[in-house]
Interface confidence: low
């Protein structure tokens, strides 16, 4: 397949990735699905540099990322290893808090108002960030 050479319209390029920043809110699963339909995924933060880039663009607003523990352990949606990877949780987070009264714990991670991460109820309608890699092979069939 061919490789992308530039980001789609309305996406922002940074370090060979393309990012799209929502201005509305969705539950985590709906945000995840939105990104997948764009041939992308919810943002996966792998470095402090990427953290600062995303933080700069979202501002002080709760925003979903591609990290969840809905099936037990914390997992990034693109398969990046959580245990050995970059983390930027707020103090005492994640805490899988049950005290919110909405049923269940907190299984989805988001950027908080200061950029650090928190786990929250996945049904909350937060903004989200999609990411796709520029050098990812496109989904078009190869030319024969």
């Amino acid at each position: 397949g061919s490789e992308r050479t530039c980001c789609p319209v309305n996406w922002v390029e940074h370090e060979r990735s393309c990012y799209w920043f929502s201005r509305s809110g969705k539950a985590w699963a709906d945000a995840d699905n939105y990104c997948r339909l764009e041939d992308a995924h919810l943002v996966v933060v792998t470095s402090w540099e990427e953290q600062k880039f995303v933080q700069h663009h979202i501002g002080p607003v709760n925003t979903w990322m591609g990290l969840h523990d809905q099936n037990g352990p914390w997992k990034w949606v693109d398969g990046t290893d959580y245990e050995t990877g970059f983390k930027n949780w707020r103090p005492e987070q994640p805490d899988d808090w049950y005290g919110h009264g909405l049923g269940g714990g907190e299984d989805c991670a988001h950027f908080t108002d200061d950029g650090r991460w928190n786990d929250d109820v996945c049904q909350r309608p937060y903004r989200w960030v999609c990411e796709t890699e520029l050098d990812k092979a496109s989904q078009e069939p190869p030319l024969l």
Epitope: V61, N62, R90, E92, Q93, D95, W97, Y98, G99, H100, G101, T112, D113, N118, D120
Partner: antibody
Framework: QVQLQESGPGLVKPSQTLSLTCTVS??????????WSWIRQHPGKGLEWIGY???????YYNPSLKSRVTISVDTSKNQFYLKLSAVTAADTAVYYC?????????????WGQGTLVTVSS | EIVLTQSPDFQSVTPKEKVTITCRAS??????LHWYQQKPDQSPKLLIK???QSFSGVPSRFSGSGSGTDFTLTINSLEAEDAATYYC?????????FGGGTKVEIK
């Protein structure tokens, strides 16, 4: 430094509605991630949590008081409110407003000074 | 709801003595247990959050431990200004609840 100040009538007649205001200064009540609670303390007794409110207006009330309690917010005034209906002498207490630590599970890190409300005819 | 049982209800202690207050939860709350100090005619003040983390500005003689259902607040080398009532509070399950309090008096 966030500060909280309760205000309202110190005397309420039985069967009437108790109404209190908590004014927040030194920080915005709209700061996403904070919960704002009402807690009361009967004379010489322990603490009883009444309920909380998120800046968006979502609330959760103690089931023991749920049928009589309303907590609301006015973000433009940086205030939140407690209404407790059909009061009896058993509602005589010091009423505190308090701020929960970031993201709801860090304990109450800031309290008002409290206001005594007496229910009597 | 989660019931928090504090013991003892009352403790009379001489200065420089060690004070231990326990709080037992009726079901597991992980580390979502906090301790407050309340002096007469004052509002409660947060001392320890998350069972063992000192809140900012709290003297180092105050410490907390425990998880699950059993928690302890320790005051090492009690000072006269520590005369107060101490409350535990759980935030792990709704409704939020408090222990009944432990009054510490200076002999």
């Amino acid at each position: 430094q966030v500060q909280l100040q309760e205000s309202g009538p110190g005397l309420v007649k039985p069967s009437q509605t108790l109404s209190l205001t908590c004014t927040v200064s030194g920080g915005s009540i709209s700061n996403s991630g904070y919960y704002w609670s009402w807690i009361r303390q009967h004379p010489g007794k322990g603490l009883e949590w009444i309920g909380y409110m998120y800046y968006s207006g979502s609330t959760y009330y103690n089931p023991s008081l749920k049928s009589r309690v309303t907590i609301s917010v006015d973000t433009s005034k940086n205030q939140f409110y407690l209404k407790l209906s059909a009061v009896t002498a058993a509602d005589t207490a010091v009423y505190y407003c308090a701020k929960g630590g970031y993201n709801w599970n860090n304990g109450f890190d800031c309290w008002g000074q409290g206001t005594l409300v007496t229910v009597s005819s | 709801e989660i019931v928090l049982t504090q013991s003892p209800d009352f403790q009379s202690v001489t200065p420089k003595e060690k004070v231990t207050i326990t709080c037992r939860a009726s079901q597991s709350i992980g580390s979502s247990l906090h301790w407050y100090q309340q002096k007469p005619d004052q509002s409660p003040k947060l001392l320890i959050k998350y069972a063992s983390q000192s809140f900012s500005g709290v003297p180092s003689r105050f410490s907390g431990s425990g998880s699950g259902t059993d928690f302890t607040l320790t005051i090492n080398s009690l000072e006269a200004e520590d005369a107060a009532t101490y409350y535990c509070h759980q935030s792990g399950r709704l409704p939020l609840t408090f222990g009944g309090g432990t009054k510490v008096e200076i002999k």
